[in-house]
């Protein structure tokens, strides 16, 4: 939802968390503001305190329940409001009718581990975290490998067009240090975006076998 120079963006992690960022040019830094969540067909509502993340933007997490509980469904609509204190009163600064499963951003994949490493290849696995059972297998992943002397931005993206929680990296250089990251995205949702990148996993390929003396 955008009002002039105000921007209010929220994402649902598919289970029990809605993360919101509100930015407004010229807003007072010391103003106390909150995000209020009112589902259209649930008995609960939730509030979180917006905390500054930069000069003109604030963020907060609406914790709806235990991390793996399915607190919202595909047909829920949540009214989200930014409310800021003005003296003794609260003023509404932004509002949106939020369809959780159209605005998804999952948690970063976790538990990355090297399953098997050789001189030129490495098999890596991971797990998805706090992802709804709704998705079944309809998720996709992006992965990238950091090579020596390069940056993450230069790393080519590898796309896995299905729910495949492992990858076999090929054509690696022997006895070389690498780092690996992965992120996940459901197919569902018009405004759905990629999860954050996972924590990097560092690994080293095995040295090449020494050639036999002739």
């Amino acid at each position: 939802a955008v009002n002039g120079t105000s921007r209010f963006t929220c994402f649902y992690n598919s289970r029990a968390n809605i993360s919101c960022v509100w930015s407004q040019d010229g807003a007072l830094q010391d103003t106390s503001c909150q995000v209020h969540a009112w589902p259209d067909r649930r008995r609960w509502n939730q509030t979180c305190e917006l905390l500054p993340v930069s000069q003109a933007s604030w963020a907060c997490n609406l914790i709806l329940g235990t991390p793996d509980s399915q607190k919202l469904t595909a047909v829920d609509i949540v009214t989200l409001r930014v409310m800021c204190r003005e003296g003794v009163r609260w003023r509404m600064m932004a509002i949106q009718d939020f369809k959780p499963f159209e605005n998804l951003r999952l948690m970063a994949p976790i538990s990355l581990q090297v399953v098997h490493v050789e001189t030129h290849r490495c098999n890596i696995s991971w797990k998805i975290s706090q992802a709804s059972h709704y998705f079944e297998r309809h998720l996709e992943f992006e992965a990238r490998t950091l090579s020596p002397g390069h940056t993450w931005e230069e790393a080519p993206l590898m796309t896995l067009k299905q729910k495949q929680e492992w990858i076999c990296l090929e054509t690696l250089t022997p006895d070389t240090q690498y780092e690996f990251q992965v992120r996940v995205k459901p197919l569902q949702g018009e405004f759905t975006t990629w999860s954050p990148w996972s924590q990097p996993l560092a690994f080293r390929t095995k040295p090449a076998a020494l050639g036999k003396d002739t």
Epitope: V75, E102, L187, E190
Partner: antibody, heavy 117, light 107 residues
Framework: EVQLVQSGAEVKKPGATVKISCKVS????????IHWVQQAPGKGLEWMGW????????EYAPGFQDRVTITADTSTDTAYMELSSLRSEDTAVYYC??????????WGQGTTVTVSS | EIVMTQSPATLSVSPGERATLSCRAS??????LHWYQQKPGQAPRLLII???QSISGIPARFSGSRSGTEFTLTISSLQSEDFAVYFC?????????FGQGTKLEIK
């Protein structure tokens, strides 16, 4: 292999209630959604509702809300759809299906219900 | 309730030729549109999800596309087993609704 096996054909009188079962195998029933769809001769496919076995919630389409009840028995991996106050226009094939909320990935073979006096 | 309108009601095409089936939504549904195939005496089978993503195990000759509220299912080279009824279904607003179907028959 994913399978959904439905109970047999039923003939009912107007005003009666029918209860159809859907026994599933090949996937984790406790973490799944089971949907029910009606296919009546003149009306095409109509989504009746679903049960979310993990969350323990049901969702019914407005057109069926006051007459349909969807339940599940997780001990036998079986879902049920009960339709009450039957009328002639309820004569149809009823399907159970598995899927996320948005589309139906696997279907049962269908159960024919005939409502006739 | 969103109304899904499929056209034509019946489409006659020769084997080996291309078939184009249309589905229009009565309001904007983003890419929340899915296609099914149904053969006589059988349950529907899911073919395409989110307008254009094909389901694993479905032949590559089936493809989907979208232009606004108009969605198209294309079968590039018809095989004998493709002659069936095709349904579209929206999942943008509950209750989710199906089109009335397009019957694809042998010319």
């Amino acid at each position: 292999e994913v399978q959904l096996v439905q109970s047999g054909a039923e003939v009912k009188k107007p005003g009666a209630t029918v209860k159809i079962s859907c026994k599933v195998s090949g996937f984790n029933f406790k973490e799944s959604l089971i949907h029910w769809v009606q296919q009546a001769p003149g009306k095409g496919l109509e989504w009746m509702g679903w049960i979310d076995n993990e969350a323990g919630e049901t969702e019914y389409a407005p057109g069926f809300q006051d007459r349909v009840t969807i339940t599940a028995d997780t001990s036998t991996d079986t879902a049920y759809m009960e339709l009450s106050s039957l009328r002639s226009e309820d004569t149809a094939v009823y399907y159970c299906a598995r899927g996320g909320p948005w589309f139906l990935s696997y279907w049962g073979q269908g159960t024919t219900v005939t409502v006739s006096s | 309730e969103i109304v899904m309108t499929q056209s034509p009601a019946t489409l006659s095409v020769s084997p080996g030729e291309r078939a184009t089936l249309s589905c229009r939504a009565s309001q904007i549904i983003s890419n929340n549109l899915h296609w099914y195939q149904q053969k006589p005496g059988q349950a529907p089978r899911l073919l395409i999800i989110y307008g254009l993503q094909s389901i694993s195990g479905i032949p590559a000759r089936f493809s989907g596309s979208r232009s606004g509220t108009e969605f198209t299912l294309t079968i590039s080279s018809l095989q004998s087993e493709d002659f069936a009824v095709y349904f579209c279904q929206q999942s943008n607003n509950w209750p989710y609704t199906f089109g009335q179907g397009t019957k694809l028959e042998i010319k």
